[in-house]
Amino acid sequence: AIVFIKQPSSQDALQGRRALLRCEVEAPGPVHVYWLLDGAPVQDTERRFAQGSSLSFAAVDRLQDSGTFQCVARDDVTGEEARSANASFNIKWIEAGPVVLKHPASEAEIQPQTQVTLRCHIDGHPRPTYQWFRDGTPLSDGQSNHTVSSKERNLTLRPAGPEHSGLYSCCAHSAFGQACSSQNFTLSIADESFARVVLAPQDVVVARYEEAMFHCQFSAQPPPSLQWLFEDETPITNRSRPPHLRRATVFANGSLLLTQVRPRNAGIYRCIGQGQRGPPIILEATLHLAEIEDMPLFEPRVFTAGSEERVTCLPPKGLPEPSVWWEHAGVRLPTHGRVYQKGHELVLANIAESDAGVYTCHAANLAGQRRQDVNITVATVPSWLKKPQDSQLEEGKPGYLDCLTQATPKPTVVWYRNQMLISEDSRFEVFKNGTLRINSVEVYDGTWYRCMSSTPAGSIEAQARVQVLEKLKFTPPPQPQQCMEFDKEATVPCSATGREKPTIKWERADGSSLPEWVTDNAGTLHFARVTRDDAGNYTCIASNGPQGQIRAHVQLTVAVFITFKVEPERTTVYQGHTALLQCEAQGDPKPLIQWKGKDRILDPTKLGPRMHIFQNGSLVIHDVAPEDSGRYTCIAGNSCNIKHTEAPLYVVDKPVPEESEGPGSPPPYKMIQT
């Protein structure tokens, strides 16, 4: 059987404080424990949750935790269930509330010599005791003219007189704590001889040169006095008016009339009522001069048919607040329908093309009227005037593809080539009317082109295939001057393309036929063994039926290619001595020799006194220094070819001879000594 070792018990608890209902169970097998509140399972929250088998309250709540708690233990296997004793909280709390008028029913009914009852809406458990205050001073129960009923939480004033006027508050305390009224009550019982407001002046806004009227009335017994003052404290009477208030009139009933109002009349007017007793009552009202500013400009708007759009009209700053309305074609828009005004907004629902045009927002107040136009365009989907056509464009010439469309507003046209957007550059240009110009058509421009014409309403597109009519041309053009190595095999290629595959043949420029050892094989001129006589001018001729023929002239030179007779060697020289780097080359035409030292060409005209290049090509450097060390390259070149060879130069310190060495001992490496 399931047995409760600890059962929950009823207990006192404080609102908002911690509490714990204990429950401990012993059973033969595992059980699960849950809690009921008034018979319903308790769901865990951050405020109230199971802690083991017990129920923990982080903050007791007098509303959510009132009721009967019960701990239930269940053996889910056997189905046996045991229930603890019921437990509940005696929750102690106190809650602030306002001081309210209980009698009479409204403040307006409070008259001198009537009974006034106030109630303190502080509640709590256990019932708190109450203390009343007037203007912060405690009221004791035994005082004359009032009684305090703690049970009713009431303060009764009988009869109420002017001496009871003041701010009433209450506080209450119990075992739980203390609270004071959240809102206090101001009791005002007038003395008949005190001035009381009957009619207070209101702020006025008038247009320039119009009239303004302020009303003001007080009552008292005996009747009170009334005086008007303007901002600078100058009294206004029918006998003595300030200079800037010449057109002011004070009527017998207290009203003040100002005629032909000017900017200097704007400001605060004070109406002062004084009874036989009591303080003066000062009432203020402001005279504002009406004004209206200019309206901001509208940007033109583009809308699409079928959509719903709104245009907001920001009213200009003004006093009084300007009223706003919309007009179209001189007619004020209604407040409902398809095209209507809602607040300050122009609303166009299910826009039609016919809605396009100028709409005007008007704003007006006493100071005048302002207006601002907004131009509304209803966008249409573009339509074709001329679609791009499949075209044959000539290579090297400008090519044009049309894309002529019309719409409102003017459509924007973009072009794509092979699905890639064409950005305007030196080769492509899109004209204002949408036409694409290809400045100099190339073979690879032969592909698909697509143009898209768009407005906010939508877009249309079309594509066309471009076929490039290739011009007859050499690919690549043969080099006009070429060299062949004497006594060797040589080839001179010539190829061309055109709309039709061209025929290619070689001729000697003088018209003589090619010798038998020279063959023309599909445009490649082949020399089996070059002789001196093969030098000369040759012409490559490419031709086809539709395009005729083209010619390329080539001057062939026969040359003996360069070889080095003498090459510079790796050289080591003592500092201060002279270095000689020899270089001699042969070939036909006779090669020229240049030297490169430490990665720069040595210009013979700018060598200075230490360096010299001999006619035979050798380089001499006098008075060598360590910085002359490095690689030196001999470059031999003629009109047909170029060749180079290099060697390092080392500059070393001259060793001091040791006594053991004889004067004729050889250096440890190859040297040039001078």
Partner: antibody
């Protein structure tokens, strides 16, 4: 001997009502929770509801409103009242005490 | 509405195999452990195997074991025996005295 016996099953027309009984022997219902579980032909087990030791009842969301569990402790019997029956209510209905002790089940067929 | 999902729905295995069935709940079970496993054979009432996630019911062989917490649980049969071919159900208890079954896992001979 502790055992549960269901009864009251049978053929009923769509829209009709039926009351199943589960008679317990060998223990007192007032100390135990009793479950009703059903199983449609060829389908899985489906929990219907529970009545706890105090007589409070709790139901699967689909059973609320149409099905009612009650008990008579003097007869040591638990009941399942089924109203507005539909063809999809056709199943073997089991009563069970806790997880361990199950009845043999009773077949309810809803068909016109 | 609480949903308990078993996987796989069907499982073919051989005698001696290790078999794992998982059960996932759409919300945590009460106390994170109020979960049971049943075995059912055709025409019979379900038989309790495991209760409170991992406790073996009386008379159930030790090759059956359960584990998990919160909303994810597993039933393991360490070495399948001929008598173990049946349908298995998980069964969860939730706050508010609400219970639910998984849709079942049918274990068949490979």
């Amino acid at each position: 001997e502790v055992q549960l016996v269901e009864s009251g099953g049978g053929l009923v027309q769509p829209g009709g009502s039926l009351r199943l009984s589960c008679t317990a022997s060998g223990f007192s219902l007032s100390n135990y929770v009793m479950n009703w579980v059903r199983q449609a032909p060829g389908k899985g087990l489906e929990w219907v509801g529970i009545i706890d030791s105090s007589g409070s009842t709790y139901y699967a969301s689909w059973a609320k409103g149409r099905f009612t569990i009650s008990r008579d402790t003097s007869k040591n019997t638990v009941y399942l009242q089924m109203n507005s029956l539909r063809a999809e209510d056709t199943a073997v209905y089991f009563c069970a005490r806790g997880l361990y002790l199950w009845g043999q089940g009773t077949l309810v067929t809803v068909s016109s | 509405e609480i949903v308990m999902t078993q996987s796989p729905s069907t499982l073919s295995a051989s005698v001696g195999d290790r078999v794992i069935i998982t059960c996932q709940s759409s919300q945590s079970v009460y106390n994170n452990n109020l979960l049971a496993w049943y075995q059912q054979k055709p025409g019979k009432a379900p038989k309790l195997l495991i209760y409170y996630t991992s406790n073996l019911a009386s008379g159930v062989p030790s090759r059956f074991s359960g584990s998990g917490s919160g909303a994810e649980f597993t039933l393991t049969i360490s070495s399948l025996q001929p008598d173990d071919f049946a349908t298995y159900y998980c069964h969860g208890g939730y706050n508010g005295n609400i219970y639910a079954f998984g849709q079942g896992t049918k274990l068949t001979v490979l």
